[in-house]
Interface confidence: medium
């Protein structure tokens, strides 16, 4: 239970802390465990103990092995271990997983990356940042703090991430890399066979011979990003640049999101200047996504206009 | 109806390009929409791109900016461009349409019969 993991990287700085925890009034010793060699606290040593943290200034592969730090009180006395493995640089570009520190998810709303390890350093911003060993460049990604943003997250972003910084100490600076995997995950996204919210299926619209009219086709496909989400007019079964009417054009309104967070889309059917032979065609409102289509349908009936005579 | 044939797949290596073709003949007055999917050895079948009779498009994350879709009203022919293709991108590639019926689910779009796209140094 009080026995920590630790591992870093040949002429890396490397900072350990102690897994037995206490307040910054008591004292901690550190000992090599194979040898129950006391650890010196004198920075001049290349690896030190400064109080509940062991640091490797910088690191070597001989360094490996198991510590024991004593936290120790009036009252009593608190053992733990440090488990150090000390790894030689890869030539290649892979993490190994004995490198990998724990996999973290991300999606669009909530993209950041934190560098692990970093706060027990004595680091300046800014962290590089690198996925899959190459640096990071461009305007999606951000160094911030001590972590990473990335905006606009896709499936393509999940890989493995490597911050690396310069810690100093006593004015001589040390380097530091740290690599998670980062996976992308849908935030509660989800698809649904097209709901058409508007027109109603079947419905009639009373129109006025002469003037202009608009039909809106209102449909909504799930929550989150959709995939080939689509709403448009037919006329009499035929798509509206087919049907040759120059007066009646469909126009792409805006993409809708309401307050439950649904994606919504509308588009309006504008016919120009009715005609009585309008009122023959059959108008039909699609709404398509992968799940498949639905068609709502409706008919224009002749709005009979008031007569201020009687 | 409306039956789709595919045309263009073929053996290309890693960072190669194709296009693919798909001719739409039969119901095409009433198309809504056509698609472009794959299905790679043990998996399932995937949507790679989209496009609706009005024009707008849709890509799945793993090939945008890689892959083009586009549609030749005039021929009836649906493409898929394909950039930068990786090995991952190795499947049998589907062509699906649906067209202006009442209500139609994913799996009563018309479907293609499928090209192979081999991604292999």
């Known amino acids: 239970k009080f026995s920590k993991q630790s591992w870093g990287l040949e002429n890396e700085a490397l900072i350990v802390r102690c897994p037995r925890q206490g307040k910054p009034s008591y004292t901690v010793d550190w000992y090599y465990s194979q040898t129950n060699k006391s650890i010196p606290t004198q920075e001049r040593n290349r690896v030190f103990a400064s109080g509940q943290l062991l640091k490797f200034l910088p690191a070597a592969v001989a360094d490996s092995g198991i510590y024991t730090c004593i936290v120790r009180s009036p009252t009593f006395n608190r053992t733990g271990y440090a488990n150090v493995t000390i790894y030689k640089k890869q030539s290649d570009c892979n993490v190994p997983d004995y490198l990998m520190y724990s996999t973290v998810s991300g999606s669009e709303k909530n993209s950041k990356i934190y560098c692990p390890t970093i706060d027990l350093y004595n680091w300046t911003a800014p962290l590089e940042w690198f996925k899959n060993c190459q640096a990071l460049q461009g305007s999606r990604y951000r160094a911030h703090k001590s972590f990473l943003v990335i905006d606009n997250v896709m499936t393509e972003d999940a890989g493995d991430y490597t911050c690396k910084f310069i810690h100093n100490e006593n004015g001589a600076n040390y380097s530091v890399t740290a690599t998670r995997s980062f996976t992308v995950k849908d935030e509660q996204g989800f698809s649904l066979f097209p709901v058409i919210g508007a027109p109603a299926q079947n419905e009639i619209k009373e129109v006025e011979i002469g003037k202009n009219a608009n039909l809106t086709c209102s449909a909504c496909f799930g929550k989150g990003t959709q995939f080939l989400a689509a709403v448009l007019w037919q006329l009499n079964g035929t798509k509206i640049t087919d049907f040759g009417e120059p007066r009646i054009q469909q126009e792409e309104g805006q993409n809708q999101s309401f307050s439950n967070g649904l994606a919504c889309l509308d588009m309006v059917l504008r016919i120009a200047d009715v005609k009585e032979e309008d009122l023959l065609l059959q108008y039909d409102c699609l709404a398509l996504n992968l799940h498949g289509l639905r068609r709502h349908t409706v008919r224009l009936s002749r709005k009979n206009p008031i007569d201020h005579h009687s | 109806e409306v039956q789709l044939v595919e045309s263009g797949g073929g053996l290309v290596q890693p960072g190669g390009s194709l296009r693919l073709s798909c001719a739409a003949s039969?119901?095409?007055?009433?198309?809504?929409?056509m698609g472009w999917f794959r299905q790679a050895p043990g998996k399932e079948r995937e949507a790679v791109a989209g496009i609706v009779s009005g024009g707008s498009t849709s890509y799945a994350d793993s090939v945008k900016g890689r892959f083009t879709i586009s549609a030749d009203n005039s021929k009836n022919t649906a493409y898929l461009q394909m950039n930068s293709l990786k090995p991952e991108d190795t499947a049998v590639y589907y062509c699906?349409?649906?067209?202006?019926?009442?209500?139609?689910?994913?799996?009563?779009?018309?479907w293609g019969q499928g090209t192979l796209v081999t991604v292999s140094s």
């Open positions: 039969g119901s095409i007055y009433s198309l809504v929409a």
């Open positions: 699906a349409a649906v067209g202006g019926a009442t209500t139609v689910t994913a799996s009563e779009w018309d």
